[in-house]
């Protein structure tokens, strides 16, 4: 089988090490530790040009490019994630030429595929019914029920629902900061077999799609009185190492590619969906923009009004969410229970070194329109009676979260397994 279809290597020849470990290795070597100290002083409160004009700073940067720190990466949800990211950016913000449209992801590349999730989902669901067969099922409701059958999922979901739903005062709908934190904990600590099913469930009617939209409690976590400008929002996000990293990871894994059959980098739907989910609970939180069951459009809560001469850049940034064939295909493929079938020797990961150019990918006009997959799963949403959830003011919420106390075995929540052979 094609040897040239192997996944591309990471930068250089060293296997990547996590930045916390790389920092320890650097600290144990006097030349590295002194140069790292110098670099941190160089970066403190100075712009890149001033820093590079300083010979000592330049020398420190050159030495560190040969150290494990240069190639280090972090893992999402790792114990010292923030510390790891701080180390990563302390090196890489000195290397990049000002603000880049697409930044390298500090996270290790994803090696798993959607098909791995499907296998686990079918194990956890414990039922043999296929979604295609059961036209009456509401996949988003089934996903919530499946979550409630798992202690960890149920606990963390109940937690974010109660926090994001707690009204502080008549003028303040909720504590957004706490809501975001609870959402982050849910998406970082609950296995994706559960979280993806809630976020990316396939729908055929509006009630189901509204439940999907309500998954992250958008009135607290997403919407605001006014929509900020997207580039301003990106600027705010980039001042925080975690938010900056999640956005960079989204771009690395979901940026529309003319080079792959799915329009996703390395044909890896799983990496894109994981990166999308990883942004929830930050300033750049994305969500479904409406309750359309089939026209999947997601976006952060922002617009390009008031962009001035940055209008084009802003629109380009927003299109990576709203008109992204990779993200759309990935969401639809998950909903349909299908994965792209690349050969066994196909790529298993993607290198996420930062590109050094800023241009729109050369996608021909007909590509983004012709790559969406038709949904083959037929579902209907069923009305659910309020069952013991403390009174909430939102009609939508009563529909979307009432099954928290139910313990019904889901009648149909198994995902179709992808074909193993060519189709």
């Amino acid at each position: 089988s094609p040897s040239s279809l192997q996944g591309p290597e990471l930068h250089g020849w060293r296997p990547p090490v996590d930045c916390v470990r790389a920092n320890e290795l650097c600290a144990a070597e006097s030349n590295c530790s002194s140069r790292y100290r110098t670099l941190r002083q160089c970066l403190a409160g100075r712009d890149r040009n001033t820093m590079l004009a300083n010979k000592e700073c330049q020398a420190a940067l050159e030495v560190l490019q040969e150290s494990p720190l240069y190639d280090c990466r972090c893992k999402r949800g790792m114990k010292k994630e923030l510390q790891c990211l701080q180390i990563y950016w302390s090196i890489h913000l000195g290397l990049t030429e000002g603000e880049e449209f697409y930044e390298a992801s500090p996270y290790e590349p994803v090696t798993s595929r959607l098909s791995d999730i499907f296998r686990l989902a079918s194990i956890f669901s414990g039922t043999g019914a296929d979604p295609v067969v059961s036209a009456k099922s509401n996949h988003c409701l089934d996903a919530a029920k499946a979550c409630n059958l798992n202690d960890n999922c149920k606990k963390l979901r109940s937690s974010y629902i109660s926090i994001c739903n707690r009204e502080i005062s008549p003028t303040e709908r909720c504590n957004r900061r706490k809501c975001h934190k609870a959402l982050r904990q849910f998406f970082d600590r609950v296995p994706s077999e559960y979280t993806y099913r809630m976020l990316f469930c396939s729908c055929q009617d509006q009630a189901c799609a509204e439940r999907r939209r309500q998954t992250i409690l958008p009135s607290c976590s997403y919407e605001d009185k006014e929509k900020p400008n997207c580039l301003d929002l990106r600027g705010v996000c980039r001042t925080d190492h975690l938010c900056r990293s999640r956005l960079a990871d989204f771009h690395a894994n979901c940026r529309a590619s003319y080079q792959t059959v799915t329009s996703c980098p390395a044909d890896n739907y799983q990496a894109c969906l994981g990166s999308y989910a990883g942004m929830i609970g930050f300033d750049m939180t994305p969500n479904y923009v409406d309750s359309s069951p089939t026209g999947i459009v997601v976006s952060p809560w922002c617009s390009c009004r008031g962009s001035g001469n940055m209008e084009e850049e802003c629109e380009k940034f927003l299109r990576d969410f709203t008109e992204n064939p990779c993200l759309r295909n990935a969401i639809q493929a998950f909903g349909n229970g299908t994965d792209v079938n690349v050969s066994p020797k196909g790529p298993s990961f993607q290198a996420t070194q930062a590109p050094r150019v800023e241009k729109t990918p050369s996608l021909p006009d007909d590509l983004s329109d012709s790559t969406s997959l038709g949904t083959s799963v037929i579902t209907t949403c069923t009305s659910v009676q309020e069952q013991g959830l403390k009174a909430n003011n939102s009609k939508e919420l009563s529909m979307c979260f009432t099954e928290l106390t139910t313990n019904i075995i889901p009648g149909s929540n198994k995902v179709i397994k992808p074909n193993s052979g060519p189709s």
Partner: antibody, heavy 119, light 112 residues
Framework: EVQLQQSGPELVKPGASVKISCKAS????????MHWVKQRHVQSLEWIGR????????NYNQIFKDKASLTLDKSSSTAYMELHSLTSEDSAVYYC????????????WGQGTTLTVSS | DVVMTQTPLTLSVTIGQPASISCKSS???????????LNWLLQRPGQSPKRLIY???KLDSGVPDRFTGSGSGTDFTLKISRVEAEDLGVYYC?????????FGGGTKLEIK
């Protein structure tokens, strides 16, 4: 073993159409683009277009937009290229080639189909 | 369209001697994903083209390591450290970064 088996040589009259086939085996057909390339004489290769077997999406080189139609039959892992309104300028060797740019562009080439347009 | 210019048109080399082919593109071939989609193909007489190198410098399986690809942006080079009889044929560079994909005009390698 990966193989792209193309249909045999064609001799057709000007104004007619012809359909060339390319049967793939030995790899996941839906995982990689199928490209078509024209070679009129040695030291001249032209990219006609590609079809995405994953979803049927096609991309054509503008100069071949009205000349070529790319289709496929997933069940038999076969790609087709139909050439319309043939003239002597279309006499050439046509290759199918499979692969994806991300993994290093085209990996495998068919043996070529010779098309002769003559009255 | 991106124009790919190959030089020389013909190259006559003695077996065992080195050879070098240049390929220049009218635009940078660095894509937004950080990769440069530049390939080298060899078409031996009477055969289909066969890829030797992809992503500028990566050798296809079975390609001898006497072949090396290098370059970035708009300037690329294919080098053969010691030419062997089986290396004769026409060499093409091919870019896949920009739409539509385009080929160089080819360089014919002859054995002296």
């Amino acid at each position: 073993e990966v193989q792209l088996q193309q249909s045999g040589p064609e001799l057709v009259k000007p104004g007619a159409s012809v359909k060339i086939s390319c049967k793939a085996s030995g790899y996941s057909f839906t995982g990689y683009f199928m490209h078509w390339v024209k070679q009129r004489h040695v030291q001249s290769l032209e990219w006609i277009g590609r079809i995405n077997p994953y979803n049927g999406a096609t991309n054509y080189n503008q100069i071949f937009k009205d000349k070529a139609s790319l289709t496929l039959d997933k069940s038999s892992s076969t790609a087709y290229m139909e050439l319309h309104s043939l003239t002597s300028e279309d006499s050439a060797v046509y290759y199918c080639a499979s692969g994806g740019h991300y993994y290093g562009n085209v990996d495998y080439w068919g043996q070529g189909t010779t098309l002769t347009v003559s009255s | 369209d991106v124009v790919m210019t190959q030089t020389p048109l013909t190259l006559s080399v003695t077996i065992g001697q080195p050879a070098s082919i240049s390929c220049k593109s009218s635009q940078s071939l660095l894509d937004t994903d950080g990769k440069t989609y530049l390939n080298w193909l060899l078409q031996r007489p009477g055969q289909s083209p066969k890829r030797l190198i992809y992503l500028v410098s990566k050798l296809d399986s079975g390609v001898p390591d006497r072949f090396t690809g290098s370059g970035s942006g708009t300037d690329f080079t294919l080098k053969i450290s010691r030419v062997e009889a089986e290396d004769l044929g026409v060499y093409y560079c091919w870019q896949g970064t920009h739409f539509p994909q385009t080929f160089g005009g080819g360089t014919k390698l002859e054995i002296k």
